[in-house]
C-alpha cells in the first residue's frame, strides 16, 4: 500500500492576510484565522512529517479583497509560488480581468501547473495560450506518479469574462478522454481537481471512470467528520464518499473558502492504484498556528501599496451620495441606485443574441449601505470612502429565483416598515409600488421587472412562475436580514465579485457620477 496526503484549498478569494472568523478584515489578531503565512506554517509542518504530500488549489484565488484590486493576480502567483503549490485548477473568477488578466499575472508567473480539461481555446488565442494551462499534469510524488486532471465551471461565461475564444465544455464529457489518456500512460492514481461546485464534484466521482479522488471548489462546501471547530455547519462528512457507476468508493472533498481551513485528506492506494482507504478533515487555521515569519514579512512588504491605493481618487461625484440609514431604510436612495447600477454593469455578458443581457435585476438590503459620500470634498471618491459604505467585505452574487420568491422578498422588505430595519430593499431593473395601508405580507401592489430577452429593455409585470436572474449581496443569498425565502427557494447561486471592487470599477469607468432618485420605489394609498 502507498499513502498520499492531499492538502487542498479552494475559493481563497484574495485572503492573503489573516482574517476574522467570518473571513472579513482581521481586527483582533489573537482571534484571527487563515492567511498565507499561517497556511505555510501548517503546510511545512505536514511536509516535514509525512512523505508523500501534494498541495492543490481548486480555483478562485482571484477576486475578493483590495489585494486583487491592486495586484490583479500577481499576488496570487507570487504567494502560491512561495508556498510551493503543486497544481491549481482554474476557477471562474480567474477570468474576471479577461484572458489577458489571467495570462500575464498568473499563467506567465506560476511555477506550478494550472489545469482545466474542459476549457478549449480557439481562434488567435489558441496559439497564444497553448501550454500555459493544461488539461492534466502527471506529478512525481515519492517513488510514484499521480495524475491531476482539471475542470472549470461551464457557467464561467455567465459568471466572468473569458471572452469569445474560450469554449467551456461539459465537465464529464471533457474529463473522460483525459483520464483515459492518463490510464494509457500507466498513471493509475488520478485526482480530479476542479471548480464546478459540490453537485458536479459528486457527478464527476460517479460518472468519470478512472477518477480516484475529487478535490473541488466553487460552492464553498464545508465537509467535516465529528464536531466542527468553528461556525461553519458541515454539508456532509469529510471525505464525502460517492459510489461510482462502476462500483468504486470515490472520496470527494472541498475545504469551505477564504483560506480559513486547509483540507487534509489521507488516501491509501493498493499496488494497482485502487483507493483502499481515505480519511481526514479540514484543519482550522486559527491563531494556535503561528504565521511563518518570512512569508509574513513578504506580506507586509506587499501591503504597503494597498495603503497608498486606498486614498487615491477613483472618480468623482457631482451629487450627494445619500447612503444614510434615514433614507436607504425608508425609501429609494441614490446610493442604492448607484450600487445596483454598478452591480448590473459588472454583470454585462452578451452571450446570446436573443438577450441584451442575461440579467437585468438587482436587489440590495438598505441596511448594507453604511455611509453617505459628500460631494463637497471636491467630488472625490476613494476606495476608503467606499469601504465606509460597504464595510463588510461581501460579494455581489448571481442567483436564479422564481417570480413568487421575489414577490415574497419584496413583501418582507416592508413587512415592518418604519422601524429603520435593514431589510428595506434598494433596487435596479425593478419598479415596485408599496401600499403601506395594507396588512404586512400584502403590501406590494405593483412589481414590474426589466426584460432581458428584448432588444429595447422595458418593464413588464413580474410573472410568478417565471425564473429570473438577480444580482444581490451574498448576505441576502444566504438568507440575511430575514430573507429566508431567498436562501430556501433559490434555484442557483454563484458567488460574484467583491462588493467594493464592483462599485469602484464602475466609478472608475464612469469617471463622473450623478445618480438620482428616479421612481424605482414608490408608495401609494388605495386601489390600483
Amino acid at each position: 500500500a502507498w499513502e498520499l496526503t492531499i492538502l487542498h484549498t479552494n475559493d481563497v478569494h484574495s485572503r492573503l492576510e489573516q482574517t476574522s472568523e467570518d473571513s472579513s478584515k482581521c481586527v483582533n489578531a489573537s482571534r484571527c484565522m487563515g492567511g498565507v503565512a499561517r497556511l505555510f506554517t501548517k503546510v511545512q509542518q505536514i511536509r516535514r512529517a509525512e512523505p508523500n504530500v501534494l498541495l492543490l488549489d481548486a480555483g478562485d484565488q482571484y477576486q475578493g479583497t483590495i489585494w486583487f484590486t491592486v495586484y490583479k493576480g500577481a499576488e496570487v502567483a507570487h504567494f502560491m509560488n512561495a508556498l510551493r503549490y503543486d497544481a491549481m485548477a482554474l476557477g471562474n473568477h480567474e477570468f474576471d480581468n479577461g484572458v489577458e488578466g489571467l495570462i500575464e499575472p498568473l499563467l506567465k508567473e506560476a511555477k506550478f501547473p494550472i489545469l482545466s480539461a474542459n476549457i478549449k481555446a480557439k481562434g488567435p488565442l489558441a496559439s497564444q495560450i497553448s501550454g500555459l494551462y493544461l488539461p492534466y499534469k502527471v506529478l512525481p510524488v515519492g517513488d510514484e506518479v499521480v495524475g491531476i486532471v482539471g475542470y472549470t465551471s461551464k457557467e464561467t461565461p455567465f459568471l466572468s469574462n473569458p471572452g469569445t475564444n474560450l469554449v467551456f465544455e461539459d465537465e464529464i464529457t471533457a474529463l473522460q478522454p483525459e483520464v483515459d489518456k492518463l490510464k494509457t500512460l500507466n498513471v493509475n492514481k488520478i485526482i480530479a481537481l476542479g471548480h464546478s461546485g459540490f453537485e458536479m464534484d459528486k457527478l464527476i466521482a460517479q460518472k468519470v471512470r478512472g477518477v480516484d479522488v475529487v478535490v473541488g471548489g466553487h460552492s464553498n462546501t464545508f465537509l467535516y467528520t465529528g464536531n466542527p471547530p468553528s461556525k461553519e455547519v458541515p454539508a456532509g462528512k469529510y471525505p464525502f464518499i460517492v459510489t461510482s457507476d462502476d462500483g468504486r468508493k470515490v472520496p470527494v472533498v472541498q475545504a469551505y473558502a477564504f483560506g480559513k481551513y486547509l483540507g487534509y485528506l489521507k488516501i491509501e492506494f493498493d499496488e494497482r492504484g485502487n483507493v483502499i482507504s481515505s480519511h481526514g478533515n479540514p484543519i482550522l487555521l486559527n491563531s494556535s498556528i503561528p504565521e511563518d515569519p518570512s512569508i509574513k514579512a513578504d506580506i507586509n512588504k506587499w501591503r504597503i501599496k494597498l495603503d497608498n491605493y486606498s486614498t487615491q481618487e477613483l472618480g468623482k461625484t457631482i451629487v450627494y451620495l445619500d447612503g444614510s440609514s434615514q433614507s436607504c431604510r425608508f425609501r429609494e436612495c441614490n446610493m442604492g441606485n448607484l450600487i445596483c447600477d454598478a452591480m448590473i454593469n459588472n454583470n454585462l455578458r452578451h452571450t446570446d443574441e436573443m438577450f441584451w443581457n442575461h440579467v437585468s435585476m438587482c436587489i440590495l438590503n438598505g441596511g448594507g449601505i453604511r455611509s453617505p459620500i459628500d460631494e463637497r470634498n471636491n467630488g472625490t471618491i476613494t476606495w476608503e470612502n467606499l469601504a465606509a459604505v460597504l464595510p463588510f467585505g461581501g460579494t455581489f452574487d448571481l442567483v436564479q429565483l422564481k417570480g413568487s420568491t421575489l414577490k415574497k422578498a419584496f413583501e418582507h422588505s416592508v413587512h415592518r416598515y418604519g422601524q429603520s430595519t435593514g431589510e428595506f430593499l434598494q433596487v435596479g431593473g425593478i419598479h415596485v409600488v408599496y401600499d403601506l395601508s395594507r396588512k404586512p405580507g400584502d403590501r406590494v401592489v405593483k412589481l414590474d421587472v426589466l426584460c432581458t430577452k428584448c432588444r429595447v429593455p422595458s418593464y413588464d409585470p413580474l410573472k410568478m412562475d417565471e425564473v429570473y436572474k438577480v444580482i444581490l449581496p451574498n448576505f441576502l443569498a444566504n438568507g440575511g436580514d430575514g430573507f429566508q425565502m431567498i436562501k430556501d427557494e433559490l434555484l442557483r447561486h454563484d458567488s460574484g465579485d467583491q462588493d467594493i471592487n464592483v462599485v469602484s470599477t464602475y466609478i472608475s469607468k464612469m469617471k463622473v457620477i450623478y445618480p438620482a432618485v428616479e421612481g424605482r420605489i414608490k408608495f401609494s394609498t388605495g386601489s390600483h
Partner: antibody
Framework: EVQLVESGGGLVQPGGSLRLSCAAS????????MHWVRQAPGKGLEWVSG????????DYADSVKGRFTISRDNSKNTLYLQMNSLRAEDTAVYYC????????????????WGQGTLVTVSS | DIQMTQSPSSLSASVGDRVTITCRAS??????LAWYQQKPGKAPKLLIY???SLESGVPSRFSGSGSGTDFTLTISSLQPEDFATYYC??????????FGQGTKVEIK
C-alpha cells in the same frame, strides 16, 4: 508623458567604475520591473540586468555578473547601474527599459526605452 | 541560455511589399516572444509582445505569429517609415532575456 532619461555615461579607463542613472516619469515607477540593455557600436541588443518592482528579484547577464550592480530608489523614481571593473567589451550605448507588465517577477517585454547613454571603456 | 536566430540578416524591399522576418528559438519558449523596431541612433520600440499581441499605437500592418520555437513578424504593406532594423526577443519564464541578431530592412 511616459519617459526614461539615462545619464552618467562617459569615457572611463579599463578597470574603472561608472554609475548610470535612469530617471523615470509619467508612470508609477514602483509598479514595474526595470532593466538595462546595451548595444555595442554597430552590433545588436544585449540584455544586461533586471530588477523587479520591489527589488526582490535581481538578474544579471553572465557577462557582467560580479562586476555590475543594479538597484532602484522608488522614492526618487530612479534606476541605477553601478559598473565596476569595466572592460573594453563593455563599450556600448546603455538603455534603461521598463517591463510592460505590473508587478512581474519573471521576464517580460520592454515597452518603454530611454534614449540611451554612451559608455566608452578605453585607455 | 536560449539562442535566438533571425533570418534573413538583411533584406531589400520596396514600399508596398509584404515583408516576413522569422525568428527561431533554440528551445521551446511558448508564446513569450517580442518584436522590436530600431532606427539608427534611436532606442528600440516595442511592436509585438506575446508572439502575436500588437502593442498599442503600433500600426495594424505589423503582425506576429508562432508559438514554441518558430515565430514570424509580418509587415503587410511596407511603408517608408518601416525601413529599420528589427529584433526578436525571448522572455520565457525564469531564463535570461535574449535577443536575435537583428534583421535590417533596406530600400530596394
Amino acid at each position: 508623458e511616459v519617459q526614461l532619461v539615462e545619464s552618467g555615461g562617459g569615457l572611463v579607463q579599463p578597470g574603472g567604475s561608472l554609475r548610470l542613472s535612469c530617471a523615470a516619469s509619467g508612470f508609477t515607477f514602483d509598479d514595474y520591473a526595470m532593466h538595462w540593455v546595451r548595444q555595442a557600436p554597430g552590433k545588436g541588443l544585449e540584455w544586461v540586468s533586471g530588477i523587479n518592482w520591489n527589488s526582490d528579484n535581481i538578474d544579471y547577464a553572465d557577462s557582467v555578473k560580479g562586476r555590475f550592480t543594479i538597484s532602484r530608489d522608488n522614492s526618487k523614481n530612479t534606476l541605477y547601474l553601478q559598473m565596476n571593473s569595466l572592460r573594453a567589451e563593455d563599450t556600448a550605448v546603455y538603455y534603461c527599459a521598463k517591463d510592460r507588465r505590473k508587478y512581474s517577477n519573471s521576464p517580460g517585454a520592454f515597452d518603454i526605452w530611454g534614449q540611451g547613454t554612451l559608455v566608452t571603456v578605453s585607455s | 541560455d536560449i539562442q535566438m536566430t533571425q533570418s534573413p540578416s538583411s533584406l531589400s524591399a520596396s514600399v508596398g511589399d509584404r515583408v516576413t522576418i522569422t525568428c527561431r528559438a533554440s528551445q521551446i519558449i511558448g508564446p513569450w516572444l517580442a518584436w522590436y523596431q530600431q532606427k539608427p541612433g534611436k532606442a528600440p520600440k516595442l511592436l509585438i509582445y506575446r508572439a502575436s499581441s500588437l502593442e498599442s499605437g503600433v500600426p495594424s500592418r505589423f503582425s506576429g505569429s508562432g508559438s514554441g520555437t518558430d515565430f514570424t513578424l509580418t509587415i503587410s504593406s511596407l511603408q517608408p517609415e518601416d525601413f529599420a532594423t528589427y529584433y526578436c526577443q525571448q522572455y520565457n519564464s525564469y531564463s535570461p532575456w535574449t535577443f536575435g541578431q537583428g534583421t535590417k530592412v533596406e530600400i530596394k
